[in-house]
């Protein structure tokens, strides 16, 4: 049966979570990608900007479950309007700023 | 220490608005991550979720009851308040409030229960 | 809202027995599981959380398992302390929901 919505957004924070709290080294060796406008769109204005990340496999598995989130295909180099203007951040900032977002929407059971 | 207690009316008639306040002691509800939320027990039975407020004001309710109910919380007295509006026999419950704390994944894992306070509806 | 179904309703053990409470969901809550006790009079107490996890305080004798919808209370040697109703709680996301209990008693 399909993963509720509630369920799959947890997951997704939980793997966020394990980021988080695994990271020994500079996640993705410092790797930096455009910061996003975190009040729409976040699930596909965030693959977005990691699919730009090649080669890290510490963010792989979001890499994926964000694809599931969003409705549309994304492609590297693809840019949306949601991408704050010329401001790159650490994919572990980046990863941490998503974290706290996610579970804001959570705790109001936005779930899709 | 940490400690909740409950205060209420102890009796309320049909169709009146229940007012239940909880005092926390130990803790603030304007540190991040923590959380109150509101159980009942009827007599003799088990337990019921009510409502659920965390530190930055998000709200949740028992989507049976939501048209009743309404948290709040008060920093500055360190209090939560429950109202449930138009009660009814059936109201008739020892009412807790307990803390929540989130916790990387986000846990709803209360903590800390107040001792409870009786609420009878009756005419 | 997920259901939270618990067995059995009462159950009476000597002390000293090994004794399992029960409890499912209706949809997989991926551990986010919580044990409550109440004993009479009093208000509920915390016992076990996430599944498995316990607070500080909590004797080693009580214990936590499962996975997906099925999880287990285990008292490994029932005490006459432990006379009370057992409540697990899903905690996956609200609303929050109570398994009906289950009622300890010594023979």
């Known amino acids: 049966s399909p993963v509720p919505p509630s369920t799959a957004l947890k997951e997704l924070i939980e793997e966020l979570v394990n980021i988080t709290q695994n990271q020994k080294a500079p996640l993705c060796n410092g790797s930096m990608v455009w910061s996003i406008n975190l009040t729409a769109g976040v699930y596909c204005a965030a693959l977005e900007s990691l699919i730009n990340v090649s080669g890290c496999s510490a963010i792989e598995k979001t890499q994926r479950m964000l694809n599931g989130f969003c409705p549309h295909k994304v492609s590297a180099g693809q840019f949306s309007s949601l991408r704050v203007r010329d401001t790159k951040i650490e994919v572990a900032q980046f990863v941490k700023d998503l974290l706290v977002h996610l579970k804001k929407l959570f705790r109001e059971g936005q779930f899709n | 220490e940490v400690t909740l207690r409950e205060s209420g009316p102890g009796l309320v008639k049909p169709t009146q608005t229940l007012t239940l306040t909880c005092t926390l002691y130990g803790f603030s509800l304007s540190t991040s991550d923590m959380g109150v939320d509101w159980i009942r027990q009827p007599p003799g039975k088990g337990l019921e979720w009510l409502a659920h407020?965390?530190?930055?004001?998000?709200?949740r309710y028992n989507p049976a009851l939501k048209s009743r109910l309404t948290i709040s919380k008060d920093t500055s007295k360190n209090q939560v308040v429950l109202k449930l509006t138009s009660v009814d026999p059936v109201d008739t419950a020892t009412y807790y409030c307990a803390r929540t704390v989130s916790s990387g994944y986000i846990y709803y894992a209360m903590d800390y229960w107040g001792q409870g306070t009786l609420v009878t509806v009756s005419s | 809202d997920i259901q939270m179904t618990q067995s059995p309703s009462s159950l009476s053990a000597s002390v000293g027995d090994r004794v399992t409470i029960s409890c499912r969901a209706s949809?997989?809550?991926?551990?986010?599981l919580n044990w409550y006790q109440q004993k009479p009079g009093k208000a509920p107490k915390l016992l076990i959380f996430y599944t498995s996890m316990k607070p500080r305080g909590v004797p080693s004798r009580f214990s936590g398992s499962g996975s997906g919808t099925d999880y287990t209370l285990t008292i490994s040697s029932l005490q006459p302390e432990d006379i009370a109703t057992y409540y697990c709680?899903?905690?996956?996301?609200?609303?929050?929901?109570f398994g009906g209990g289950t009622k300890v008693e010594i023979k």
């Open positions: 949809q997989d809550i991926r551990n986010y």
């Open positions: 709680q899903q905690g996956l996301t609200p609303p929050l929901t």
């Open positions: 407020i965390w530190w930055d004001d998000v709200k």
